[in-house]
Structure formats: structure tokens, C-alpha cells
Interface confidence: low
């Protein structure tokens, strides 16, 4: 019968020739009257048998994660007869892998939108890279991630990849980060290889600002001869969020006299303050109203940053006009 | 360590006034929305007021607005409590406690101080 | 504003013993948005849960929090001594109100 044991060979070998194992039958007793063949993908190419021994050889360099075995067939045969001493067999020779190849990520570009404010542990993205090398082969594809870039903002869990936030961030002061990962093969230990990545994260806004006027005191005219439903002025308010969470309603807080009112142009976000009754210089020649700003949709977890919503004092001064 | 100490507590007459403080060490006071909240003997837990990190807003319980003012001085690490016009229901512990990073619920909190009012 | 009310007012248990504490919304509390507190005479409260569920840094595995809208319940799955205290739900989706308190004391 056929004897031999498993057979390896490490890839990338740069020796011209490399012995692999022997492969002989147990009816050879050693005076070269046997002789070996190899054949299948890769015999005479890549790999040699001694063919009075049995001795196979590795004659070219190999790379396992182009090719990590090879199903090679073996004969032995009588030189004196030219007849088979055993049956044709198969064999297997397996490729082992070295670390050649460094993680690399195959998704990027990454990106990723969290809310500003998001509390220390929320997760962001998972950034996953791969390693071409054996997963089973030691530590050659095992993954280490960690932060280059986006302390202290950002962490990532070595083992998984996975993005979270380590220190709430405000969108109103910076909008975006960039964040590096490196994932290191070998677990980190020494000889390993890595690859980088780079992640875009965007802060998307919610509602922790109010709006606030931009003076406190408005001073607004009105002619006495003003019909109902007048414009008088405008007032407005800004507010540090955006989109949605910047839209404001403007509304009278205080105004005894019932002769004003305050609409929103939801379009300019500004405050129009309209005549609700007319007016009479002889009467009153002057009013004195405080308004009241808040945003239009405020989450309730979000409400106390919008308590004691801001106000503005409004001085409207009544014009004369002659009478006939 | 990460603590908060408060003081300032003492007896006092109804209609008197009394200024707490709570001194922060340990964590980044400026970046903490801050609060007051009481404990009157032998009774539940009495939310009185918040002030923001960097002091811009300030918002009170009903049964306080107009006689309590909060402030925070972010260079000394450190929160007050103004009490004027006392009142007796105004008796009880009072504790200065930390709202989260997240915000809005407190994991920090002093070992409190007493405040009586008392003819 | 929001009025939580905690049962039993008192809980007597022994060592070991499962001990479930209820708190009872006037009304939906947002987002989960409640907490629990442990308070030991003459001490500070300690937070044990916040978001429902959620347990804080420390808090033993044997405290958890459950519930949504306006019943939510606190499970303490045994009882160690050093557990016996007085524990407070907290709503703080808007403002802030606190619970009148359960007290765990020793059977």
C-alpha cells in the first residue's frame, strides 16, 4: 500500500526547490527498481517527484489565496515489468498560509448621519474589513480595529467595528468628523499588517435650541387711519438649529389693549405684527405689547431646552393724522 | 474623585434667605446641565430647579419661581442656590445633582444639605 | 404635570426574595423617558435605571426595569441585604417629578 503523511507547503517560498514529503509504497525496499510518476494540475509545473525516492517538490512559488490545495495523482511502477506496484492514488497537497495580505475594507467610502446630542454609547456604523488571508490559520486574519482619528468624540470596538459615540457633540458647533479606523491582522501582536479606512460622520440636527429674539425692545409705527388687518412691522428671531427645528411661531404674550396681533411667515420665519382693532391717536398715542417666540415642533424629551420661551417688548407709537 | 458637595444649609426664619452651594470635582462641570433638587424630612424627592452648562437658561418648579434663583459660576466648578422669602414647606435636604450626558435624568447627586425654616 | 404613583408603599421581604416595585403614570411618559433611584437613610440617591430599562454603570444584574407608556415596573430578583432601602421612580420626558416611594424592608 501507499504510505505517506500529509502533505504541506508554505505559500510565497522563494527557494527554487522545496521538499514537501515522500510518497512510496511499502513494497519498495530501497534498490531503485520503482519508479514514481506524478500527475494532474500541476505536476511537472509546479510540483516534482524524485522518481526513484518518492521525494515530492515544490518548484515554483505558491500563493495560497490564489490557490490553497492542489489534487494531485501518484503511480509507482515496476521498471522491469512496466507494470503498476500499486493502484493509481490521489493526494492532496494543501497550501499554508503566511500573512501576505493586510486587511483592507471593502465597503468605503463609509459615511454615517447621527443626531447631535446622541448620548456616549450610541452606535454609529460598523466599518468591517477583510483579510484574504486563512481565518484558520493562527492570527493571520484575526482583526483588531482602532481609532487613528475621532478621539474623543468617537470609539470603536476592536472586535466588531463597530462606531460609537464616546462624548456628545453639537451640530451648531461643528457638523461633521472624520474618523480613521485601522484594522491590524495578527490580533496586533508583532509581524502584523494593517489597512485604514476612513468614515464621514454627519450630525444630523434636533431641536436643543430655541429661537431667540434678536433685540429685546421693537419700536413699530402704526397711522391712526390704519384699517384692520395692517401690517405694522416685522420681528424675527433666530434659531441655531435647521430645516424643521429652526420653524418658529410668534404669538402676543402680553397685550391688555386686544389691539394687536402677531402672525408667522412660515416661509422668513419672521413674526408680522398686524392692527387687530383700530386705533385712535386722541385715544392712545402709544401701546406697549410683549411677544413671545417658541419653535413649531419640539419633541417633549426635548422640552427643556425650551423652557421660558424668549420675549421682546414691542413700543408701537400711534401717527396722528390730520381729521377734516 | 467624581463628587459633588454641597453647603450652605443652616436654620433660618420664615420670610429669610439662604445661598447654597455645590462644589463639583472630578468631571468637566462646564459641560453638565446642573439641578437642584429637595427632600423634606420623612417625605419624597422635590425636583427645584436646572440650569444649564454655560448658565444661558434657567428653568424652575412652580411651588419656587420668584423666590429661588439658580446660578453657576463654570471657572470655581461650582452651583448655587438663592432662597429668599422662606417659607416652613421650604424645609428639607437639599441635594445638587448632575443630569447625564444624554441629558435629563440624574447620576449624581450630593450628600445634600439642610435648609430649615423655622420661627 | 406628570403624577407618578409608586406600590406598594411598603414591601416586606426577606433575603432572596423577588421583590417587584410598580410605578403609575397620570400619562404617557415619552420615550420611556423614566428612571429609578435607590435611596439608604441619611444617603444620597443613586440611580439604578434610566430609560425604562436601562441599567446605570454598576448596577448589579439582579436590578431591572421594564414597562412603557404609564405602568412600569422595577424587578429586584433577589434580594441581597444591602438592597433594603427605599427606591424612587422618576419621569423626566417632561420636567421632572419624582414618585412618593417604595420602601424594601427586611421581614
Known amino acids: 500500500g501507499w504510505v505517506w503523511n500529509q502533505f504541506f507547503v508554505p505559500e510565497e517560498m522563494n527557494t527554487t526547490s522545496h521538499h514537501i514529503g515522500q510518497l512510496r509504497s511499502d513494497l519498495d525496499n530501497g534498490n531503485n527498481s520503482f519508479q514514481y510518476k506524478l500527475l494532474g494540475a500541476g505536476a511537472g509545473s509546479t510540483f516534482i517527484i524524485d522518481e526513484r525516492t518518492g521525494d515530492i517538490y515544490a518548484i515554483q512559488k505558491l500563493d495560497r489565496e490564489e490557490r490553497s490545495l492542489y489534487i494531485l495523482r501518484a503511480q509507482v511502477i515496476d521498471i522491469a515489468t512496466g507494470r503498476a506496484v500499486e493502484p493509481e492514488s490521489e493526494f492532496v497537497i494543501k497550501v499554508s498560509d503566511i500573512n501576505d495580505n493586510e486587511p483592507k475594507f471593502l465597503d468605503e467610502p463609509y459615511e454615517a448621519i447621527v443626531p447631535e446630542m446622541s448620548p456616549e454609547g450610541t452606535l454609529v456604523i460598523q466599518v468591517t474589513a477583510s483579510d484574504a488571508d486563512d481565518p484558520s490559520s493562527g492570527n493571520n486574519a484575526r482583526l483588531l480595529y482602532s481609532l487613528l482619528q475621532g478621539q474623543p468624540y468617537f470609539s470603536v470596538e476592536p472586535t466588531t467595528g463597530v462606531i460609537r459615540i464616546s462624548s456628545k457633540m453639537d451640530r451648531e458647533l461643528q457638523d461633521e468628523y472624520w474618523v480613521i479606523i485601522q484594522a491590524k491582522d495578527m490580533i496586533g501582536q508583532p509581524g502584523a499588517l494593517s489597512g485604514t479606512t476612513s468614515v464621514l460622520i454627519k450630525l444630523s440636527d434636533v431641536n436643543d435650541n430655541k429661537p431667540i429674539f434678536k433685540e429685546s425692545l421693537y419700536r413699530l409705527t402704526v397711522s391712526e387711519s390704519a384699517p384692520t388687518g395692517t401690517s405694522i412691522g416685522t420681528i424675527m428671531a433666530y434659531d441655531n438649529d435647521i430645516g424643521e427645528n429652526a420653524e418658529m411661531d410668534y404669538s402676543i404674550e402680553e397685550d391688555d389693549s386686544q389691539t394687536f396681533d402677531i402672525i408667522t411667515n412660515h416661509e422668513t420665519q419672521e413674526g408680522i405684527v398686524i392692527l387687530k382693532k383700530k386705533v385712535d391717536f386722541e385715544h392712545q398715542n402709544h401701546y406697549g405689547i410683549r411677544a413671545k417666540v417658541k419653535n413649531h415642533h419640539v419633541p417633549e424629551q426635548l422640552m427643556k431646552y425650551h423652557t421660558e420661551a424668549s420675549t421682546t417688548f414691542i413700543k408701537i407709537q400711534v401717527e396722528d393724522v390730520d381729521e377734516p | 474623585q467624581v463628587q459633588l458637595v454641597e453647603s450652605g444649609g443652616g436654620v433660618v426664619q420664615p420670610g429669610g434667605s439662604l445661598r447654597l452651594s455645590c462644589a463639583a470635582s472630578g468631571f468637566s462641570f462646564s459641560s453638565y446641565d446642573m439641578d437642584w433638587v429637595r427632600q423634606a424630612p420623612g417625605k419624597g424627592l422635590e425636583w427645584v430647579a436646572v440650569i444649564w452648562y454655560d448658565g444661558s437658561n434657567k428653568y424652575y418648579a412652580d411651588s419656587v419661581r420668584g423666590r429661588f434663583t439658580i446660578s453657576r459660576d463654570n471657572s470655581k466648578n461650582t452651583l448655587f442656590l438663592q432662597m429668599n422669602s422662606l417659607r416652613v414647606e421650604d424645609t428639607a435636604v437639599y441635594y445638587c445633582a448632575r443630569e447625564t450626558g444624554e441629558g435629563w435624568y440624574f447620576d449624581l447627586w450630593g450628600r445634600g444639605t439642610l435648609v430649615t425654616v423655622s420661627s | 404635570e406628570i403624577v407618578l404613583t409608586q406600590s406598594p408603599g411598603t414591601l416586606s421581604l426577606s433575603p432572596g426574595e423577588r421583590a417587584t416595585l410598580s410605578c403609575r403614570a397620570s400619562q404617557s411618559v415619552s420615550s420611556s423617558y423614566l428612571a429609578w433611584y435607590q435611596q439608604k437613610p441619611g444617603q444620597a440617591p443613586r440611580l439604578l435605571i434610566y430609560?425604562?430599562?436601562s441599567r446605570a454603570t454598576g448596577i448589579p444584574d439582579r436590578f431591572s426595569g421594564s414597562g412603557s407608556g404609564t405602568d412600569f415596573t422595577l424587578t429586584i430578583s433577589r434580594l441581597e441585604p444591602e438592597d433594603f432601602a427605599v427606591y424612587y421612580c422618576q419621569q423626566y420626558g417632561s420636567s421632572w417629578t419624582f414618585g412618593q416611594g417604595t420602601k424594601v424592608e427586611i421581614k
Open positions: 430609560g425604562a430599562s
